[in-house]
């Protein structure tokens, strides 16, 4: 049978041939009658055999990391017979390991992020090196990790490559660290090979800084003409944190006048001072307010860093603006009786310059021919007023500063013309009546009513009477209905068209004013020929039209 031991060849042997071992048949008596042959991949190129002795040699430098075993076939032939002495057999040549590979970090580059202020022992990242040498061959591939750079902030577990924090770090002082890790094989013993890797460790921000005003005092100005909502300036606090942790909210801490507000511009992280109420230089020309700033997001466990909010004082100066004259009232209402003579006093308006220089004021009335105003604001009439023409006047009074005629204010002034009893009552319309020749006594001829152009104080009351002459003629009589109307009745039986075709009746109408005014109004009554039913037969054309209910102009 075949005789051989396990074959090993060390890798990386530089000699031209290295004796691996010997193959032989136990039938071989050493008389050189046997011929040994090597077959298979590597036979003749990597390995050769001494045909006489069966000694195998490696003639090529081998790399275990490339290939760690070769399976070859062996034959032995009797030279004299040419026959196989032994059955063809397979054998294995193993390539034994030497420590010729340094550890390599295959997952480079390494980068890790860890929150600042993380406690000691916090895991940052695990780095792993690979060693191509045989892990089952001694310590060639047994690695130990150590820290070459990164103390005192980091440490590495020697056997696992786990990097941990060994000292708290403040991102605001340094936000990233380069740590260099070395991996040594042979568990660090002499002759070990090593490899290194760099780990970039970035500190992520935690909200361990509150925003702080760099300025303890801000000076701002606001024009007294600024409308509410005007931005009058910005204030700025600085937070050493970044991102969401640096977002802040500004607010008013003290503002007794409640004149200002602060809003936050979340894009620029500035505080914008806003005018909440209009200011008046003449009333108050400076203000002092206190503002505070806090972070927008604060975790409960980080509240210790945010106990007292940073504050700043803001002095706000009000800028004077040349303001137009200011009337004492927003509008005026005056009263004056009608029929008062030209130049009569109506009332006084008053405007002043609100500014400190107190410019004299000049007054004018816009488009009025009835009133006048002097430099004292006294309004007088330029004509006698008739309430029955105009009961109200709407005036526009303008006040102009003497020293700056561009500063103008206008207000409405309403003048009410008061009534006096200067109009007597009169017929509400023109009356023309008729009476039949055969009319009986007490027959109603006409109902009349009156109007008075004067304004009634409470309610007009008119009194109707016949004139003394008409009362004496006694053809007609009048009855006052006590409701501002009266009826005319016949006071006799029968009228004669030929003798007296027309009657003119004078009617007195008095009002209840003080003094009472009376007017005389004429009522025309035509006598007509009527039939038995009272329909007119013979009457002049005009009278006939009237009787039919038509009014002619």
């Amino acid at each position: 049978g075949w005789v051989w031991n396990q074959f090993f060849v060390p890798e990386e042997m530089n000699t031209t041939s290295h004796h691996v071992g010997r193959l032989r048949s136990d039938l071989d008596n050493g008389n050189n009658s046997f011929q040994y042959k090597l077959l298979g991949a590597g036979a003749g190129s990597t390995f050769i055999i001494d045909e006489r002795t069966g000694d195998i040699y490696a003639i090529e430098k081998l790399d275990r990391e490339e290939r760690s075993l070769y399976i070859l076939r062996a034959q032995v032939i009797d030279i004299t017979t040419g026959r196989a002495v032994e059955p063809e057999s397979e054998f294995v040549i193993k390539v034994s390991d030497i420590n010729d590979n340094e550890p390599k970090f295959l997952d480079e580059p390494y980068e890790a992020i860890v929150p600042e202020m993380s406690p000691e022992g916090t895991l940052v990242i695990q780095v792993t090196a690979s060693d191509a040498d045989d892990p089952s061959s001694g310590n060639n591939a047994r690695l130990l990790y150590s820290l070459l750079q990164g103390q005192p902030y980091f440490s590495v577990e020697p056997t696992t490559g786990v990097i941990r924090i060994s000292s708290k770090m403040d991102r605001e002082l340094q936000d990233e660290y380069w740590v260099i890790i070395q991996a040594k094989d042979m568990i660090g013993q002499p002759g070990a090979l090593s490899g290194t890797t760099s780990v970039l460790i970035k500190l992520s921000d935690v909200n361990d800084n509150k925003p702080i005003f760099k300025e303890s005092l801000y000076r701002l100005t606001v024009s007294e003409s600024a409308p509410t909502g005007t931005s009058i300036g910005t204030i700025m606090a600085y937070d050493n944190d970044i991102g969401e942790n640096a977002e802040m909210d500004y607010s008013i801490e003290e503002d007794d006048s409640q004149t200002f507000d602060i809003i936050t511009n979340h894009e620029t992280q500035e505080g914008i001072v806003i005018l909440k109420k209009k200011v008046n230089f003449e009333h108050q020309n400076h203000y002092g307010i206190r503002a505070k700033v806090k972070n927008h997001h604060v975790d409960e466990q980080l509240m210790k860093y945010h106990t007292e909010a940073s504050t700043t004082f803001i002095k706000i100066q009000v800028e004077d603006v040349d303001e137009p004259p200011l009337f004492l009232l927003p509008y005026y209402i005056f009263e004056i009786f009608e029929e008062t003579p030209q130049g009569s006093f109506v009332g006084v308006v008053s405007a002043t310059d609100p500014d400190n220089r107190k410019s004299p004021i000049r007054y004018s009335i816009t488009r009025s021919k009835v009133f006048n105003i002097d430099d004292n604001g006294t309004i007088t009439t330029t004509n006698s007023l008739d309430r029955e023409i105009s009961a109200w006047y709407n005036l526009s009074i303008t006040a102009t500063e003497k020293y700056n005629i561009e500063q103008i204010s206008s207000i409405p002034v309403y003048v009410q013309v008061l009534n006096i009893n200067d109009h007597a009552p009169e017929f509400s319309q023109y009356y023309e009546s008729y009476v039949c020749e055969n009319a009986g006594s007490g027959q109603v001829i006409q109902t009349i009513s009156a109007v008075d152009r004067d304004e009634s104080i409470e309610e007009h009351h008119f009194y109707f009477n016949l004139s003394v002459e008409d009362t004496n003629s006694s053809s007609f009589t009048i009855i006052d209905n006590q409701d501002n109307t009266a009826v005319i009745l016949t006071n006799r039986t029968g009228f004669n068209l030929q003798e007296e075709p027309i009657f003119y009746i004078s009617i007195l109408i008095a009002d209840n004013g003080i003094p009472s005014l009376t007017s005389t109004n004429t009522l025309t009554i035509h006598v007509c020929d009527c039939d038995d039913s009272g329909s007119t037969q013979t009457c002049q054309y005009q009278e006939l039209m009237l009787s039919m209910g038509f009014k002619t102009e």
Partner: antibody, heavy 120, light 108 residues
Framework: QVQLQESGPGLVKPSQTLSLTCTVS??????????WSWIRQHPGKGLEWIGY???????YYNPSLKSRVSISVDTSKNQFSLKLSSVTAADTAVYYC????????????WGQGTLVTVSS | EIVLTQSPGTLSLSPGERATLSCRAS???????LAWYQQKPGQAPRLLIY???SRATGIPDRFSGSGSGTDFTLTISRLEPEDFAVYYC?????????FGQGTRLEIK
Amino acid sequence: QVQLQESGPGLVKPSQTLSLTCTVSGGSISSGGYYWSWIRQHPGKGLEWIGYIFYSGKTYYNPSLKSRVSISVDTSKNQFSLKLSSVTAADTAVYYCARVYSNYGWFDPWGQGTLVTVSS
Amino acid sequence: EIVLTQSPGTLSLSPGERATLSCRASQSVSSSYLAWYQQKPGQAPRLLIYGASSRATGIPDRFSGSGSGTDFTLTISRLEPEDFAVYYCQQYGSSPITFGQGTRLEIK
């Protein structure tokens, strides 16, 4: 798991050089114990081994193609490449890259293959 | 160079049947150095068997390999529809690496 992907021109002119690259993902080309190989398959025919390379740069070629073949490796890019010079129509084939287990010689895994046509 | 001869060139069988594919080497090959592959149209070959008899990861147990020296066999105990493909043997025992010409397994 390791995956391989061939890339390169699908058409090459006769007498020119065919160049293909195989990109390895899911593992390192620098891992010991493996060769990185090229195999081709003529249309409708069997498989032909072209050659392989170890990450150290050591190469092994099929003697029938040795004079025209060059295989190289770029460990930084995790890639290996094939160059076949002086091509003729007979080099028209689907070219595969594959990983070879160096001790026992089987091919696993394979790339999906890329057809290279040699034509003017 | 070792020449691998596969037989038959084409094998026509029905699903459920047993398939036996042969690979003969022109010279002795270590069983450790023989592998079988399956290739479907438009796809790359897939490793089925290595070391003459060991199934690759994820290969169903209906596939088995045997043989030594110069004669090797791939057996599919019960054909499934997805098994119809071309099968190649490959050797690593001698340089250059060579493949058989393939056996086409088709549905009868």
